[in-house]
């Protein structure tokens, strides 16, 4: 039994890290694997994480933590029973991807304004809390040309759109993702995606 | 307010062992990391380890890896330290002493914030 | 093992007047940006007591007339205005690795 793909892993810098890995063949990764993980701190413990499958020969685990610094290390140890399969080290802070946004809500109601708003994933303890960007994704249920990204580069979590930017009496749907500059982290996943109705009253024209 | 209460003298003869108590109170004993601290008479301190009384997780020095065993009473918030092959050399005031970890959002600090009265072991034959 | 040396090993210092007490360690105990220092008093038959802890941080309860300084391998604690119940040894410690370590100690007296 052999490691094909070493271990790669990412943090949501509050409570999880996912760590993936590839094996040389098809591999029960729950009953035949271990993976051993320590921060690199003299008042620590050792945790043993079972992995689940990720496909035939992948494996994933889920490595709880009590909280994230940025000087944080910690060792990892795959073990196959009594057999060391790869020894190695992860550095949450420098693989960071953020949790997905939540409570995605569109506000139709504000004169003639789409006013999206949604819920910071963090507690306001967590040093992502006050360095998240966002990502608005809106696009038309009925034409798949229609599909557009507003970056929200401010801390708030909202949008407000002119409800005439966007097609009337059809259905569109949005999402959000974020990401934080200041640890270089990768995009979040996508929230779930929200539903609603675009109408709005066309300006009168005068002839 | 947090105490952690140590007797006060062991006489013991040389190859003897000797166990060492340290009841704590006015905390949550099972959250905290306990260690041992050696200081012979007019010396400086040693760290001889710790122990985590949650999950017996215990720690040494290498100095003290083959003769110091740290166990823990949850029922009576006591932590024990056995220590073996007494020689004169470990003639000595040993304490037990908290830690307390201090997370910023760069790092983890860890310092001895409570000790314990201190118990005076005397090595003698 | 990282190595704590303090000087001086005593000194006698005037009431009002500064103490100061170096602490040089055997390689860096930084990590991150951050120093993993601490000091201590201990009185004449007493445990040590927390004074400093992270090179800088006074513990709740002490005096501000101590004060911690330093990085890297190089750190001082100061005592200004010195007082007769600081008559004490000084120690400082390293928490960046296992196992951690006390310097000699500094015994402080009043001129």
């Known amino acids: 039994m052999k490691v094909l793909q070493e271990p790669t892993c990412v943090s949501d810098y509050m409570s999880i890290s996912t760590c993936e890995w590839k094996m040389n063949g098809p591999t029960n990764c729950s009953t035949e694997l271990r993976l051993l993980y320590q921060l690199v701190f003299l008042l620590s413990e050792a945790h043993t994480c079972i992995p689940e499958n990720n496909g035939g020969a992948g494996c994933v685990c889920h490595l709880l933590m009590d909280d994230v610094v940025s000087a944080d290390n910690y060792t990892l140890d795959l073990w196959a029973g009594q057999q060391l399969l790869w020894k190695g080290s992860f550095k949450p802070s420098e693989h960071v991807k953020p949790r997905a946004p939540g409570n995605l809500t569109v506000h139709t109601n504000v004169s003639d304004t789409l006013l999206l708003t949604w819920s910071n994933p963090y507690p306001p303890d967590n040093y992502l809390y006050n360095h998240l960007t966002y990502a608005v994704n809106i696009w038309s249920e009925n034409d798949p040309a229609d599909f557009r990204i507003y970056n929200v580069t401010y801390l708030e979590p909202s949008l407000r759109i002119a409800a005439s930017t966007l097609k009337s009496g059809i259905s569109y749907r949005a999402r959000v993702r974020a990401w934080a500059q200041c640890y270089n982290t990768t995009w979040s996943e996508w929230s779930p995606s929200t539903k609603w109705h675009n109408s709005y009253r066309e300006p009168f024209e005068q002839h | 307010q947090v105490q952690l209460q140590q007797p006060g003298t062991e006489l013991l003869k040389p190859g003897a062992s000797v166990s060492l108590s340290c009841k704590a109170s006015?905390?949550?004993?099972?959250?905290?990391?306990m260690h041992w601290v050696k200081q012979r008479p007019g010396q400086g301190l040693e760290w001889i380890g710790l122990?985590?009384?949650?999950?017996?997780?215990?720690k040494f020095s290498e100095n003290f890896k083959t003769r110091a065993t740290l166990t823990i009473d949850k029922s009576s918030s006591t932590a024990y330290m056995k220590l073996s092959s007494l020689t004169s050399e470990d003639s000595a005031v040993y304490y037990c002493?908290?830690?307390?970890?201090?997370?910023?959002?760069?790092?983890?600090?860890?310092?001895?914030?409570?000790w314990g009265t201190g118990t005076t072991v005397t090595v003698s034959s | 093992d990282i190595v704590l040396t303090q000087s001086p090993p005593s000194l006698a210092v005037s009431l009002g007047q500064r103490a100061t007490i170096s602490c040089k360690a055997s390689?860096?105990?930084?990590?991150?940006?951050?120093?993993?220092m601490n000091w201590y008093q201990q009185k004449l038959g007493q445990p040590p007591k927390v004074l400093i802890y992270?090179?800088?941080n006074l513990e709740s309860g002490i005096p501000a007339r101590f004060s911690g300084s330093g990085s890297g391998t190089d750190f001082t604690l100061n005592i200004h205005p010195v007082e007769e119940e600081d008559v004490a040894t000084y120690y400082c410690q390293h928490s960046n690795e296992n196992p951690p370590t006390f310097g000699g100690g500094t015994k402080l007296e009043i001129k």
């Open positions: 006015g905390y949550t004993f099972t959250s905290y990391w």
């Open positions: 992270a090179a800088s």
């Open positions: 390689q860096s105990v930084d990590y991150g940006g951050d120093s993993y």
């Open positions: 122990i985590h009384p949650n999950s017996d997780t215990t």
């Open positions: 002493a908290k830690s307390k970890i201090i997370t910023t959002i760069v790092a983890r600090h860890w310092y001895f914030d409570v």
